[in-house]
């Protein structure tokens, strides 16, 4: 029985190292050894790989070694299976190297936040030494939080024949661990690196992003006083790295101001003791950078109707903010 | 056995024009590359064309560009020279030629590795370009 | 276009002896690219060399070829009478193919 016709013919320009092709069926019932014919050079040149006689006849692949490996260049390749009872030749397929060249990954050696840009990290790496001079590359960034399985990516072009390269994305969290990695190809290929070794980097911090706020009614004491627990936590989607100095609370009876009173802690959790009227609680962590939004609370009047829900309470602050991902070189 | 049979050769006039013909026998043709190559009377040889075995054109000697033309049919086992615009310098015995993949020494690794050579000539169809 | 150089034009050998040619590029030529043909009075060239080194089937082992780069060289270890002809070198590296301009062997 003839060998089957090689079909699905498959070729890759890893640069520099060899140009390999692969196909179908990757196994034969009989011993079959094949021959993979190419014209190069622009169609000048002609050879054969072959697999005769070889361990690894039976074997669905073939590779050209330099210094016959030229680029730019267009290849022309057929492959012909051959068993004892005769050959089967594939269809002529043509190849473009710049479409099918695959390089080393880049190397990142450094995240860094830049002085005084918030939200930003500056990527260093090094264009892959295995890689066309001269030539456009294009890349894919992966970036995600620390603690996150899940991968954003942003793509973009660098034109540049420098070997150190810069890349700046914008509009992160603030003091926050990313991780990131890199991967690139020629502009026209289709193949991508694979993806270089994972760097980390960590966002300048800024002033606390939020408090969520909350507060426990308890029962009126004998002279009048209602105690109020006031409870608070770093709001959702804060710096996982966050740490506040302290937290700074006023409170004052409603359209009454000048009864303000103020407390300083360092707990997130403070006991107030108020009138009978209706109150305003407002609270803000701080650090070093300055102070959160602030978080409000209103307290009911003794009198005001509450139902039985209202004895443990929370005032979640949602800010107004959009988080989307813009990057800029 | 493998054989190659020029015809085609004539006495033209200059600017005249002259089809060859190589009928090939004895191999699988389109596994070959094909040359043309002349040689002047009391000259040496001298590449004219060639065409892969993809029936690319493998390029022309700077002398015969943009005045011949190679091409193959497979069909038929043959390769032909169109030549155009014949000048007296064009004069010569024209010999059709045999690219064949001949396998060089052990360059190491799984595979082996042939290239492509001259190795069967016809015996030539002489070309005259005289007024 | 790359030239090929031969020399010399013409030696005439006694036989028994050695005999070497030399084919020049004019520049850099790929071993796998480099071949000799022998032409004998009234025939067809035939493959004498090809990749510099490999010697063609049926060819004799007095034949063999050396070199690298821009220079390389054929050499007859024991000339015998069927081997006078013209000998040529052929680059096949860059286009257009060209030819040395030939070496005539003869017999002293």
């Known amino acids: 029985v003839l060998p089957a016709k090689p079909e699905n013919i498959s070729c890759i320009f890893y640069y520099e190292e060899n140009f390999t092709c692969t196909w179908s069926p990757e196994k034969e019932a009989s011993y079959t050894w094949y021959k993979v014919k190419r014209t190069y050079s622009y169609g000048y040149k002609s050879d054969i790989c072959s697999t005769d006689n070889s361990t690894r006849g039976n074997h669905a692949s073939c590779s050209f070694l330099p210094p016959t490996i030229t680029n730019p260049d267009n290849y022309t390749i057929q492959v012909e299976a051959q068993n004892a009872d005769g050959i089967m030749k594939s269809d002529i397929t043509y190849w473009n190297l710049d479409a099918i060249m695959k390089i080393e990954p880049p190397e990142i050696f450094s995240v860094k936040s830049v002085l005084g840009i918030k939200r930003m990290l500056q990527i260093k790496w090094i264009r892959p030494v295995l890689a066309p001079h001269s030539s456009t590359l294009k890349y894919t960034l992966r970036f995600r939080t620390i603690n996150s399985a899940y991968w954003m990516e942003v793509n973009f072009t660098k034109e540049d024949i420098d070997r150190d390269e810069t890349y700046n994305l914008t509009e992160l969290q603030a003091f926050t661990e990313y991780v990131m990695t890199l991967r690139c190809a020629p502009a026209e290929s289709m193949f991508w690196s694979g993806w270089s070794q994972e760097k980390v980097g960590t966002t300048e911090e800024e002033a606390p992003y939020g408090l969520d706020l909350w507060r426990v009614l308890k029962p009126a004491m004998v002279d009048g006083r209602r105690p109020v627990q006031l409870m608070w936590k770093k709001a959702t989607g804060a710096p996982v790295l966050e740490k506040a100095l302290g937290y700074n609370i006023w409170y004052f009876p409603e359209n009454n101001t000048n009864l303000t009173e103020t407390v300083n802690t360092t707990n997130q959790t403070h006991e107030l003791y108020l009138g009978g009227k209706t109150y305003w609680v407002y609270v803000v962590s701080y650090n070093s950078l300055g102070e959160s939004p602030v978080a409000t609370l209103r307290i009911p009047a003794l009198n005001e109707k509450t139902g039985l829900n209202d004895i443990f309470e929370a005032q979640k602050i949602e800010w107004h903010e959009h988080h989307h991902h813009h990057h800029h070189h | 056995e493998v054989q190659l049979v020029e015809s085609g050769g004539d006495l033209v006039k200059p600017g005249g024009s002259l089809r060859l013909s190589c009928v090939a026998s004895?191999?699988?043709?389109?596994?070959?590359?094909m040359s043309w190559v002349r040689q002047a009377p009391g000259k040496g040889l001298q590449w004219v064309s060639g065409?892969?075995?993809?029936?690319?054109?493998?390029g022309y000697a700077d002398a015969v560009k943009g005045r011949f033309t190679i091409s193959r049919d497979n069909a038929r086992n043959t390769v032909y020279l169109q030549m155009n615009s014949l000048r007296a310098e064009d004069t010569a015995v024209y010999y059709c030629?045999?690219?064949?993949?001949?396998?060089?020494?052990?360059?190491?690794?799984?595979?082996?590795?042939?290239?492509?050579?001259?190795?069967?000539w016809g015996q030539g169809t002489l070309v005259t370009v005289s007024s | 276009e790359v030239v090929m150089i031969q020399t010399p034009l013409s030696l005439s050998v006694s036989p028994g002896e050695p005999a070497s040619i030399s084919c020049r590029a004019s520049?850099?030529?790929?071993?796998?690219?480099l071949v000799w043909y022998l032409q004998k009075p009234g025939q067809s060239p035939q493959l004498l060399i090809y990749?510099?080194?490999s010697r063609a089937t049926g060819v004799s082992d007095r034949f063999s070829g050396s070199g690298s780069g821009t220079d390389f060289t054929l050499r007859i270890s024991r000339v015998e009478a069927e081997d006078v002809g013209v000998y040529y070198c052929?680059?096949?590296?860059?286009?257009?193919?060209?030819f040395g301009q030939g070496t005539k062997v003869e017999i002293k």
């Open positions: 052929q680059q096949y590296d860059n286009a257009p193919r060209t």
């Open positions: 004895g191999f699988t043709f389109d596994d070959y590359g």
């Open positions: 065409i892969n075995w993809a029936g690319g054109t493998i």
């Open positions: 990749g510099t080194s």
């Open positions: 030629a045999r690219e064949s993949p001949l396998r060089l020494g052990d360059l190491g690794g799984d595979y082996f590795y042939y290239y492509y050579y001259i190795d069967v």
């Open positions: 520049q850099s030529v790929s071993s796998r690219y």
